[in-house]
Amino acid sequence: LIIGFGISGKHFITVTTFTSAGNIGEDGTLSCTFEPDIKLNGIVIQWLKEGIKGLVHEFKEGKDDLSQQHEMFRGRTAVFADQVVVGNASLRLKNVQLTDAGTYTCYIRTSKGKGNANLEYKTGAFSMPEINVDYNASSESLRCEAPRWFPQPTVAWASQVDQGANFSEVSNTSFELNSENVTMKVVSVLYNVTINNTYSCMIENDIAKATGDIKVTDSEVKRRSQLQLLNSG
């Protein structure tokens, strides 16, 4: 969370940004809020990126002004016009690229004053893992798969019964490059699993942490997975 203040004469407005992460190939949001202003035609929103000449996006007099937009962002940005009224200057970024990572500035001007705040935008790939029982193996094993990760993550297994146990000796993890030659498919197999136990497959890089849980009993298999972005908020 970054809060910036701007001063214009006696007036300053608070601008707040949230560090966020973009999943390459998907759409992302760079979050920014400001003190709402009743005079809508005086609201100017500018998004800038460190090291880039020109603007990422500009919204003024009620519409987008893309005359100074840098070509790497052409056709990929939008603000949520109906949210500007309530002080939301967040930027939608389509088809996130690895090169979109960096420091962005959300600059706001209203009839009350001006202000800005910076935002660190990380890019990578992250996806939810799915764990399945691998019945083909000679001994009962679990297979944890996640289709897209970048940078290369670490993978660790944990068990509810054997808490603190190190499963690296009884697991095998592989990373397979996807067709676009950036992201990788993560596959990890855990061997010698026991029934009536809950196992967790944890995949983590510097952008996200994902966990898949599986509980295997005689009668059923229960699965749960979650994904958490790191250093966000």
Epitope: P36, D37, I38, L40, G62, A81, D82, V85, V86, G87
Partner: antibody, heavy 116, light 107 residues
């Protein structure tokens, strides 16, 4: 001097529609949103929705979604609020106001009575 | 939606005294809160926006405070024209929502 002038009082039958107009100054229309707020007899204020002609956006409260339509005619600087499928609970004073996010000038109000 | 509550529902105060009205939001609205005064048969009048900024023409004896979920409107040295109903309104998120009002009466 900012002024919002609304159309006159109406009596409507249940099931019918109502349409209230709100004439504003040109500056108000080009620079601000126009919202609609209603007040049932002896009750509090209830935001129905609003339009920001400069942004080309309109938002409605969930409660009225599908039953209310807010439009803006830039050429005459007039906003309209239409409410369909009227019922007795819609009897209220309907106000137009300059804003959101907050409302600094209000129309005089239009009393709409829904009765059979 | 964000639910606004106000307390007390009614308040009896003598002229010349101070009145403090409270408004609570069901979730944080930062400082995105406005206060209105309404007299019988009249449209509401904006008093405060941004939780603490007085609207044009509002006297200094009217002040607003608070942020997040708890807000107050204080009127010091009450005058006859101050007796009315007061509403708070959040504008952090759509839909904009009002509190049920506090009726300020002469004691």
């Amino acid at each position: 001097q900012v002024q919002l002038v609304q159309s006159g009082a109406e009596v409507k039958k249940p099931g019918s529609s109502m349409r209230v107009s709100c004439k504003a100054s040109e500056d108000t229309f080009s620079s601000y949103a126009i919202s609609w707020v209603r007040q049932a007899p002896g009750q509090g204020l209830e935001w129905m929705g609003g339009t920001a002609p400069i942004f080309g956006t309109t938002n409605y409260a969930q409660k009225f979604q599908g039953r209310v339509t807010i439009t803006a005619d830039k050429s005459t600087s007039t906003a309209y609020m239409e409410l369909s499928s009227l019922r007795s609970e819609d009897t209220a004073v309907y106000y137009c106001a300059r804003g959101g996010p907050y409302f600094d000038y209000w129309g005089q109000g239009t009393l709409v009575t829904v009765s059979s | 939606e964000i639910v606004m509550t106000q307390s007390p529902a009614s308040l009896s105060v003598s002229p010349g005294e101070r009145a403090t009205l409270s408004c609570r939001a069901s979730q944080s609205v930062s400082s995105n809160l406005a206060w209105y005064q309404q007299k019988p048969g009249q449209a509401p009048r904006l008093l405060i926006y941004g939780a603490s900024t007085r609207a044009t023409g509002i006297p200094a004896r009217v002040s607003g405070g608070g942020s997040g979920t708890e807000f107050t409107l204080t009127i010091s040295s009450l005058q006859s024209e101050d007796f009315a109903v007061y509403y708070c309104q959040q504008y952090k998120n759509w839909p904009f929502t009002f509190g049920p009002g506090t009726k300020l009466e002469i004691k």
